[in-house]
Every structure is written in C-alpha cells, then in structure tokens.
Amino acid sequence: YFGKLESKLSVIRNLNDQVLFIDQGNRPLFEDMTDSDCRDNAPRTIFIISMYKDSQPRGMAVTISVKCEKISTLSCENKIISFKEMNPPDNIKDTKSDIIFFQRSVPGHDNKMQFESSSYEGYFLACEKERDLFKLILKKEDELGDRSIMFTVQNED
C-alpha cells in the first residue's frame, strides 16, 4: 500500500551534469544545458516528485511526473520506461507499482540518488547513450557503483 504525501518540483541530472527533460515525442532524455537553457525549457525540465508513505518501509517511495499540457507520470511497465498520461494517484493498493520508484541516496553521498523500481527488484533508472541520444532507461544492475544509475535531484520549490 502506498499513500501520497507531499510533492516537490525538481531538476534531475545525471552525473555528467546533463539535465533530464521530456522531448516533443514524450521521451525522457538527457542533454547538456546551461541554467538558463534549463529555465527556458521549463516545464519540460521540471519534474514533480511525489512522495508516498509505504506500508513496508523500503526507502522513499516516489513517482516522477511532468506537466506540459497534461500531467504524465513515469512508468516502467514491462521494464520499458515511458511517460503515461496520468496523475500520480493518491493511493496505490499494492506493494509494487510500475510508477513507484524507491529514491535512495548512495551510501556516503547524500547528494547522489538511485531510483529502484518497486516492480522489479534490482532494476534502476539509468542514463544510457543510444546513438546520439542519452536516454532514461530501466536497467538491471548488479554494479551498484556504476555512475549511470546515479543522479542529482535539485529542488526548485
């Protein structure tokens, strides 16, 4: 069971300082941006991180949404990352959900975050280069010191 708590607005970056944004095709991508680029590209660079209380404490349970024309929420259904047109629900009556991720700091580095899927244990949000694009993917990872599964989250509130 997950119950919605508060939400915050955040900019998410990979460890190469590239900014996460949602492109015109609704794909989550990373790109080099100056602070002014980041502001100019809002709201596509501003993510709504909604926190949830968890009936089985396993870290901070969150959803990641973005509001362009409508609100879309990040999903890892079938281990594929996509934004689905939906509001983050107030309650989820299950212990797993394709839209819930556990946001946890990397041990010893409070500013570096990992996001583990609640549906797929051992699968993490990651940045992966595909041709010329840096994509947000779900990655099965047993190399927990891999920088590709680490992010910084900067609150914009």
Epitope: G59, P107, E121, K140, G145
Partner: antibody, heavy 126, light 107 residues
Framework: QVQLVQSGAEVKKPGASVKVSCKVS????????FHWVRRRPGKGLEWMGR????????KYAERFKDRVTMTEDTSTDTAYMELSSLRSEDTAVYYC???????????????????WGQGTLVTVSS | DIQMTQSPSSVSASVGDRVTITCLAS??????LTWYQQKPGKAPKLLIY???KLQDGVPSRFSGSGSGTDFTLTISSLQPEDFATYYC?????????FGQGTKLEIK
C-alpha cells in the same frame, strides 16, 4: 537455506579444458547471479566472472575472458564454469557462489556473495 | 580496475586480543564492501556487508567500518575459532576485486 553442491575434483593435463558444475538445492529467490571465484595454493581469492541466470549475460575478469565460459541450465538449477587451455598455474580450488541483494534498514541494496559451494580442486599436471 | 590493498598480510595474536584489519580501495567504492572469513579446506564465509552491517549469525565481536576508500574490520576479543584468513571484497564495479588476504595466526 540455499546450498550449492559442486562437482568433484579433477586432474587435467596442460592444454586441456575442465568444466565444473554447481547445483543449487533449497529455495532460492529470483534476482540472483552466479559468480565463480578461485583460490590458488598459497594465494588469495580471485574473482573470475559471473552469469545472470535470467538472461545468460556474463561478465568476466579480463585475465580469463579468452578462455572461460560460464553457462547456466535453469531447468536443473545448475551453473557451469569451463576453463580451457589449462596451464599449471590454473591449479586451484574453484568456488561457485550466489550474488544477491541484501538490504539495510532503509531498503538500500547491497550485493553479497552469501551461499558458497564446497569448492572443486582442479589440478593441472603433465 | 579497482585495487584493494589489505593490511597486514599476516598478524599473530592471542585469544582475547583486539585485532584490526584494513582495506584501502584505489577509488571511491561508497560502502559496497564485504568481509569474508576463510578457514583451510572450507569455503569463504560472509561476515560483514555494506562495510558495517553484520551478517545474521555472525558474533557481535566482529564489526566493520569505513566509507569511500578506507575500511576496517575489527575483532574486539579474539576467540580460538577466529584464527583464519580474512578478505575484503569491493562490489562497487566490475571486475570485482578482493584484498590480498590477512592470515590471523595464534601467537
């Protein structure tokens, strides 16, 4: 309680290959990997590589990658490690071990080698 | 590759002594470090994971500490069954690497 049972000791000639098996008995959760580690006489532990039973993907230590092959038979819950072009310095005890997530009180994941096989002595001698 | 430098390579001690073994990583491995005990003819046994978390069933005289690059395994009061070889292992990045081992012998 998970137990790993390995095949018996082997004596091989230089240039030959050896295939060691590792059978899982007991209840094991999903989301684990098999790793192989060896210990040569008078030396320390040495990581050789790992296989993911979910998709058979492997990662090998650089020094073994040209002559080691790790496989897994999900139907029998058995992992295999084959080492080819054996030389005398490959004389060692070879261990299989499971690599899986343990968590701290905040749910943070840590991978650990928890269950180990009893070891298989491979002697390479002419 | 990440190098793990373990020291000392051997140590002689008596029952009741406090013993400290250190592992130094060549780069930041966060707390992705485990400690193992190995006795002759036996498989290694997990003692500590996450640098400082005691595995179930391991006596509380064993403790681990450290983060980043510097790690320590401490045995607060040696018991006869503790004489063995101890290894650290970094699990941060592949290839996984062990320390060279510390042989704990009876003085």
């Amino acid at each position: 309680q998970v137990q790993l049972v390995q095949s018996g000791a082997e004596v091989k000639k230089p240039g030959a290959s050896v295939k060691v098996s590792c059978k899982v008995s007991g209840e094991i959760s999903t989301g684990y990997y098999f790793h192989w580690v060896r210990r040569r006489p008078g030396k320390g532990l040495e990581w050789m590589g790992r296989i993911d039973p979910e998709d058979d993907s492997t990662k090998y230590a650089e020094r073994f990658k040209d002559r080691v092959t790790m496989t897994e038979d999900t139907s029998t819950d058995t992992a295999y490690m084959e080492l080819s072009s054996l030389r005398s310095e490959d004389t060692a005890v070879y261990y299989c071990t499971t690599w899986r997530i343990y968590r701290d009180s905040s749910g943070r994941p840590f991978y650990v080698m928890d269950a180990w096989g009893q070891g298989t002595l491979v002697t390479v001698s002419s | 590759d990440i190098q793990m430098t373990q020291s000392p390579s051997s140590v002689s001690a008596s029952v009741g002594d406090r013993v400290t073994i250190t592992c130094l990583a060549s780069e930041d491995i966060y707390t992705y470090l485990t400690w193992y005990q190995q006795k002759p003819g036996k498989a290694p046994k997990l003692l500590i994971y996450g640098a400082n978390k005691l595995q179930d069933g391991v006596p509380s005289r064993f403790s681990g500490s450290g983060s980043g690059t510097d790690f320590t395994l401490t045995i607060s009061s040696l018991q006869p069954e503790d004489f063995a070889t101890y290894y650290c292992l970094q699990g941060s990045k592949f290839p996984l690497t062990f320390g060279q081992g510390t042989k704990l012998e009876i003085k």
